[in-house]
Interface confidence: medium
């Protein structure tokens, strides 16, 4: 299976809310030894490879935001803990999974990487990740609401406030 | 914050078998797996198996094929490791470790360890 | 198996002093490499995974290099906290195996 990006940028204006979006398809075994594992975290483009370094989002960690179930089940992360901070992720029926920050502010720009890991009965583990960067602005410069720009081409597209 | 607690020392007789006991608080018990790694007096670090306790089946270390059992009890949020046929070189400090996801297999949170002595 | 080897065994050093560590794979792990600290009588800690992320709550004097087979830990500062067993693991494949192990003592 693979993980795409829906948008490899998005800049908001202070104090909006954005829904960063990952999707993963292809072949995906439905059956109870197979369990999906989804979640998010902060980075930073390594030399080596991106999303290696996990950081936390708002002080909670991959661990603290994950998404765990079987097949394409839709799934929430614990509400509490995570809407404390103005976090929420989520994962629905079609393989997409999302992660909601809300009142954005300056600190909170920066790559952002979503990680699924399909893990088999036994032993066997397959890892995929994608990155988008969240730019964060202030000011006469910063749009009235947040702008996402796809993965694959340089068109921009407006989208809701969650 | 994420604590394993070991059962306590044992001693045993060679022939034996000794079953410790790792109790996981403070997270989600079942996304990760939890490994069994041991040190011998002395000597470095050595993975013996570990377990997801969503799925509940092991996975060995050749070496110990056949002689180690790692079982979890969800309920209890508690993970057991049972070495059988024990011999004098299985002294050693056991320790349980929790991977930080799946079978990522970095170890970010350990028991306090439980040392076991096989003497006659 | 996935065989570690970690050098130099033991190492003097004093508080200060840049302290580097090195452990080799004998086939390619790409960045699944780990790196543990452990005190007498203490379960290890881990300091590094992926082979240069560092671990929450670990100082920013420790660091991690490479991928394949060739990496490296370094302390850029001995503290004297710092004084311990540094372990390498590989986590590409079971059986997980780990170095043999580097002691860093006072000089």
């Known amino acids: 299976f693979k993980v795409a990006t829906l948008y490899s940028l998005y800049v908001c204006p202070e104090g909006q809310n954005v829904t960063l979006t990952c999707r993963f398809f292809g072949p995906v075994d439905k059956g109870h030894d197979v369990t999906f594992y989804k979640t998010w975290y902060r980075s930073s483009r390594g030399e080596v490879q991106t999303c290696s370094e996990r950081r936390p989002i708002r002080n909670l960690t991959f661990q603290d935001l994950h998404l765990h179930h079987g097949g394409h089940q839709a799934a929430n992360t614990s509400h509490d803990l995570a809407q404390r901070h103005g976090l929420e992720s989520a994962s629905d029926h079609h393989g997409n999974f999302s992660i909601t920050m809300r009142n954005l502010t300056l600190l909170d720009s920066g790559l952002y990487c979503c990680l699924v890991v399909e893990i088999r009965h036994h032993h066997s583990e397959h890892r995929v990740h994608g990155a988008m960067e969240l730019q964060v602005q202030t000011g006469k410069d910063a749009p009235s609401s947040c702008v996402a720009y796809p993965s694959s081409s340089q068109e921009s597209e407006n989208i809701t406030a969650a | 914050q994420v604590q394993l607690v070991q059962s306590g020392a044992e001693v045993k007789k060679p022939g034996s078998s000794v079953k410790v006991s790792c109790k996981a608080s403070g997270g989600t018990f079942s996304s990760y797996a939890i490994s069994w790694v041991r040190q011998a007096p002395g000597q470095g670090l050595e993975w013996m198996g570990g377990?997801?306790?969503?799925?509940?089946?092991?996975n060995y270390a050749q070496k110990f094929q056949g002689r180690v059992t790692i079982t979890a009890d969800e309920s209890t949020s508690t993970a057991y490791m049972e070495l059988s046929s024990l011999r004098s070189e299985d002294t050693a400090v056991y320790y349980c470790a929790r991977s930080s996801y799946g079978w990522s297999y970095e170890f970010d949170y350990w028991g306090q360890g439980t040392l076991v002595t096989v003497s006659s | 198996d996935i065989q570690m080897t970690q050098s130099p065994s033991s190492l003097s050093a004093s508080v200060g002093d840049r302290v580097t560590i090195t452990c080799r794979a004998s086939?390619?792990?790409?960045?699944?490499l780990n790196w543990y600290q452990q005190k007498p009588g203490k379960a290890p800690k881990l300091l590094i995974y992926?082979?240069?992320s560092l671990q929450s709550g670990v100082p920013s004097r420790f660091s991690g290099s490479g991928s394949g087979t060739d990496f490296t830990l370094t302390i850029s500062s001995l503290q004297p906290e710092d004084f311990a067993t540094y372990y390498c693991q590989q986590a590409r494949d079971t059986p997980i195996t780990f170095g043999q192990g580097t002691k860093v003592e006072i000089k």
């Open positions: 377990i997801i306790p969503i799925f509940g089946t092991a």
């Open positions: 086939q390619s792990i790409n960045t699944n």
């Open positions: 992926a082979a240069s």
